[in-house]
C-alpha cells in the first residue's frame, strides 16, 4: 500500500494532457503569467488526474504484492545458483502485464461495455477492502476509460 518505490509510472501532466487548460476560450491572458499558470488551472488538472491516479495506484498495489511473492522465489533460486541477470528486469514489468491481461481477459472488445462487472471484479481483488459500490461509476469517467484503453493498447516496454 506504500506510495514509495513506484518506478513503473510516468504519469504527470504532459503537454498534451495540459492542452485543454490552454484553450483560449477557457483561459484569457489575465489568468496566466509568463512563468506558468495559476492555482485555478492546477485545480482543473487535478480533477482530471484523480481517476487516472486511482487506476495507477491499483496497478502498483498489485505489482508490489506480486513482487513480494516473486522476490521470495528469486531469493531461493539465487541461493541455488540458478539466478539469472535478466530476472530483475523481467519481474519489474510482469505484474503490470498480468494486471492488464487480467483486465482484458475474456473480453473481445476494448471499449469496456461491462464497466460495472470490471469494477466489481476489481473490488473483490482490492487489498484493503475499501472499495464501495460507488466505484461502479469510475469507468464512466472519460479519463479513467481513456487511461485504461491506453494501458491495454500500449506495450509495457513503450511506456518505460
Amino acid at each position: 500500500r506504500s506510495l514509495q518505490d513506484t518506478e513503473e509510472k510516468s504519469r504527470s501532466f504532459s503537454a498534451s494532457q495540459a492542452d485543454p487548460l490552454s484553450d483560449p476560450d477557457q483561459m484569457n491572458e489575465d489568468k496566466r503569467h509568463s512563468q506558468g499558470t495559476f492555482t485555478s488551472d492546477y485545480s482543473k488538472y487535478l480533477d482530471s488526474r484523480r481517476a487516472q491516479d486511482f487506476v495507477q495506484w491499483l496497478m502498483n498495489t498489485k505489482r508490489n504484492r506480486n513482487n513480494i511473492a516473486k522476490r521470495h522465489d528469486e531469493f531461493e533460486r539465487h541461493a541455488e545458483g540458478t539466478f539469472t541477470s535478466d530476472v530483475s528486469s523481467y519481474l519489474e514489468g510482469q505484474a503490470a502485464k498480468e494486471f492488464i491481461a487480467w483486465l482484458v481477459k475474456g473480453r473481445g472488445r476494448r471499449d469496456f461495455p461491462e464497466e460495472v462487472a470490471i469494477v466489481e471484479e476489481l473490488g473483490r481483488r482490492h487489498a484493503d477492502g475499501s472499495f464501495s459500490d460507488e466505484m461502479n461509476t469510475i469507468l464512466d469517467n472519460l479519463a479513467a476509460r481513456d487511461f485504461i484503453n491506453w494501458l491495454i493498447q500500449t506495450k509495457i516496454t513503450d511506456r518505460k
Partner: antibody, heavy 119, light 112 residues
Framework: QVQLVESGGGVVQPGRSLRLSCVAS????????MHWVRQAPGKGLEWVAV????????FYSDSVKGRFTISRDNSKNTLSLQITGLRAEDTAVYYC????????????WGQGTLVTVSS | DIVMTQSPDSLAVSLGERATINCKSS????????????LAWYQQKPGQPPKLLFY???TRESGVPDRFSGSGSGTDFTLTISSLQAEDVAVYYC????????FGQGTKLEIK
C-alpha cells in the same frame, strides 16, 4: 534510498533575487512531478509551486505568482526555484518535495533551505 | 482554495495514553467515483521535514507504526495515536490532496 538536497538559501534584502536548487537521487527523477513547499519560522506549511515531469507545465500558488519560477533539469536531476522581488513574508524554509503516485501528495521531502528576507 | 482547520492547536498526552487530533475541511474532499477522501496526514519532528503518515484519510504509508490510525469522511477527519510513545512528539499536519494542496495550521503534540 530517495534523497532530496536543497541549497541556495541565505539572507537577502527585500526586492532582491535568489535561486534555490534541489538535487534528487534514489528514484527516476524524470518520471515525477516535483514541488516546492515553504514554511515560515514557527508557522505551518504552504504549497508554492509544481512542475511537470517534463518541465513543460508549471503551476504556482497565488501568493507567489509572477515572482517565482520553477524549473527542472532532468539530465542533472535538479529542481530549481527562481525567486524575484523578495518580500519579508517570503522568509521561510523552502522544501523540495517529490510527488507520489497520487497528485498533490508528497511522499519525500528534502531537509529544506532557509531564506531570510531582511534589510 | 479549501481551508483546513485543525484542533486543538496543541495537545499534551501522557505516555501510553491515546492522542486524538482533528481536522476539518471547508468543503468535502470525498471523490464519489472511488469513495476516497483525499486527505493526508504528516508528522514533522523538530528540525526535520514533514513525513507522510496517511493518504486517502486512512491508508497508512509504508513504515508507519500501527498505533497510528486515520479516519473520517467528507469534511471531518481524525488522526489517532492509540498509545503515545516518546518518539511521537511532533507537529502533525493534515493536508487535502483533492485540489490545489492546502494544509492545516498544525497541532503540536507533547508529553504530559
Amino acid at each position: 534510498q530517495v534523497q532530496l538536497v536543497e541549497s541556495g538559501g541565505g539572507v537577502v534584502q527585500p526586492g532582491r533575487s535568489l535561486r534555490l536548487s534541489c538535487v534528487a537521487s534514489g528514484f527516476t527523477f524524470r518520471n515525477y512531478d516535483m514541488h516546492w513547499v515553504r514554511q515560515a519560522p514557527g508557522k505551518g506549511l504552504e504549497w508554492v509551486a509544481v512542475t511537470s515531469s517534463d518541465g513543460l507545465n508549471k503551476f504556482y500558488s497565488d501568493s507567489v505568482k509572477g515572482r517565482f519560477t520553477i524549473s527542472r533539469d532532468n539530465s542533472k536531476n535538479t529542481l530549481s526555484l527562481q525567486i524575484t522581488g523578495l518580500r519579508a513574508e517570503d522568509t521561510a524554509v523552502y522544501y523540495c518535495a517529490k510527488e507520489s503516485i497520487l497528485a498533490a501528495l508528497f511522499d519525500y521531502w528534502g531537509q529544506g533551505t532557509l531564506v531570510t528576507v531582511s534589510s | 482554495d479549501i481551508v483546513m482547520t485543525q484542533s486543538p492547536d496543541s495537545l499534551a498526552v501522557s505516555l501510553g495514553e491515546r492522542a486524538t487530533i482533528n481536522c476539518k475541511s471547508s468543503q468535502s474532499v470525498l471523490y464519489s467515483s472511488n469513495n476516497k477522501n483525499y486527505l493526508a496526514w504528516y508528522q514533522q519532528k523538530p528540525g526535520q521535514p514533514p513525513k507522510l503518515l496517511f493518504y486517502w484519510a486512512s491508508t497508512r504509508e509504508s513504515g508507519v507504526p500501527d498505533r497510528f490510525s486515520g479516519s473520517g469522511s467528507g469534511t471531518d477527519f481524525t488522526l489517532t495515536i492509540s498509545s503515545l510513545q516518546a518518539e511521537d512528539v511532533a507537529v502533525y499536519y493534515c493536508q487535502q490532496h483533492y485540489t490545489t494542496p492546502t494544509f492545516g495550521q498544525g497541532t503540536k503534540l507533547e508529553i504530559k
